[in-house]
């Protein structure tokens, strides 16, 4: 059976009723977050390997909405929810408090001021 | 403005009203083609860098619907249409008459009998 997906912003990717867009321009984490917010979206949140299995195919590194809380060492999403165990393998690439998404559900720690491409997501 | 995408088979990726699915199981080109056909789709056809810019992000190698015609050296899609120039860089990885899609609009020549993952596509 066929079905429609969305609704999503024009020309975004729709998968399992979530909307994704990959942005080519390099921005720091804060600018990336602002860019997503301006489009009524947020930086990528990884919440399910099953519902987001398209992410295993993504090449390169892109900012996602995951940040490190230095005071307690936890990893949280922009919305304040805590990273679920077994979802991402967090790799210490640089000293930093932000994370880049890389293929096969890996997260690379990076300085939040470093420019990178980014992924915005909108949950429908 | 937001809009719906599709219609697509359940759990396929929808982008600019085309439907895509990435299959993990390795099959030869002919089996991959049959698998797509059984789902009322075809192997990936690359026809536009603009309309299919999500493909630049794809990691790894996957069968697409491009075949080499040994008698005249042309590259054609399953539907008989000719590969447009400037769309794909065709790289001679192996001697063969089928092509794997790889990120950034590259096509790798491979023996059609070699098992690989594959991308199905359905144009809406």
């Amino acid at each position: 059976t066929e079905s429609y997906c969305g609704p999503c912003p024009k020309n975004w990717i729709c998968y399992k009723n979530n909307c994704y867009q990959f942005f080519d321009e390099s921005k720091n984490w804060y600018e990336s977050q602002a860019s997503c917010m301006s489009q009524n979206a947020s930086l990528l949140k990884v919440y399910s390997k099953e519902d987001q299995d398209l992410l295993k195919l993504v090449k390169s590194y892109h900012w996602m909405g995951l940040v490190h809380i230095p005071t307690n060492g936890s990893w949280q999403w922009e919305d304040g929810s805590i990273l679920s165990p077994n979802l991402l393998t967090i790799i210490e690439m640089q000293k930093g408090d932000c994370a880049l998404y890389a293929s096969s559900f890996k997260g690379y720690i990076e300085n939040c001021s470093t420019p990178n491409t980014y992924i915005c997501m909108q949950r429908t | 403005t937001e809009s719906y995408c599709g219609p697509c088979p359940k759990n396929w990726i929808c982008y600019k009203n085309n439907c895509y699915q990435f299959f993990d199981e390795s099959k030869n080109w002919y089996e991959s083609q049959a698998s797509c056909m059984s789902q009322n789709a075809s192997l990936l056809k690359v026809y536009s860098k603009e309309d299919q810019d999500l493909l630049k992000l794809v990691k790894s190698y996957h069968w697409m619907g491009l075949v080499h015609i040994p008698t005249n050296g042309s590259w054609q899609w399953e539907d008989g249409s000719i590969l447009s120039p400037n769309l794909l860089t065709i790289i001679e990885m192996q001697k063969g008459d089928c092509a794997l899609y790889a990120s950034s609009f590259k096509g790798y020549i491979e023996n059609c009998s070699t098992p690989n993952t594959y991308i199905c596509m359905q144009r809406t």
Epitope: - | W75, I82, P85, I90, I91, E92, K95
Partner: antibody
């Protein structure tokens, strides 16, 4: 700078043989298909033969099939054309040309060498 | 084999003129067409590829158009250095074939 330099042309009798060479520089030779194109005196251009980057695909014009052999040595950045059973109608300037764009779906020729003249006459 | 028919075989024009050369393929070749310029005693030079893409370093007065079977090379304002012979070539299949050439001469 991309450069192609042909050599090996000359005067040969009908039925004779000649081997043309093309030395390439300024680009990654092993990534490109290569070609021979000829031009008879006062005439137009005629494609002769093409060889893919790894020599997997080789094509010849009907007029030279069975008599000419194209080959390449990627380690030496060199392209060759072995010409046997030469005929008067093979008299032409022979150009070596790189296939463009990069890869196996190379539809056109850029750049071209300066050419080498092959004269077949008794 | 795909035949390429070029017309006219020669054209006389003056500096500043607009010159149009046409090329017809005997079967559809999508956009797999190139145009070359050749001056006497010199090797051909690629001007246009993929029917309409201008090769790097080629002046913008040269343009190409067409798809399928009918193609055009246009020189918008002929310059003294443009007097030469022009060839079209299909690149979709082997054997690669050229048009017969168009000689652009000074009027």
């Amino acid at each position: 700078e991309v450069q192609l330099v042909e050599s090996g042309g000359g005067l040969v009798k009908p039925g004779g043989s000649l081997r043309l060479s093309c030395a390439a520089s300024g680009f990654t030779f092993s990534s490109y298909s290569m070609n021979w194109v000829r031009q008879a005196p006062g005439k137009g251009l005629e494609w002769v033969s093409s060889i893919s980057s790894s020599s997997s695909y080789i094509y010849y014009a009907d007029s030279v099939k069975g008599r000419f052999t194209i080959s390449r040595d990627n380690a030496k950045n060199s392209l060759y054309l072995q010409m046997n059973s030469l005929r008067a109608e093979d008299t032409a300037v022979y150009y070596c040309a790189r296939g463009a764009p990069v890869g196996a779906a190379a539809g056109w020729f850029d750049p071209w060498g300066q050419g080498t003249l092959v004269t077949v006459s008794s | 084999d795909i035949q390429m028919t070029q017309s006219p075989s020669s054209v006389s024009a003056s500096v500043g003129d607009r010159v149009t050369i046409t090329c017809r393929a005997s079967q559809g070749i999508s956009s797999w067409l190139a145009w070359y310029q050749q001056k006497p005693g010199k090797a051909p030079k690629l001007l246009i590829y993929a029917a309409s893409s201008l090769q790097s370093g080629v002046p913008s007065r040269f343009s190409g158009s067409g798809s399928g079977t009918d193609f055009t090379l246009t020189i918008s304002s002929l310059q003294p250095e443009d007097f030469a012979t022009y060839y079209c070539q299909q690149g979709v299949s082997f054997p690669r074939t050229f048009g017969g050439g168009t000689k652009v001469e000074i009027k």
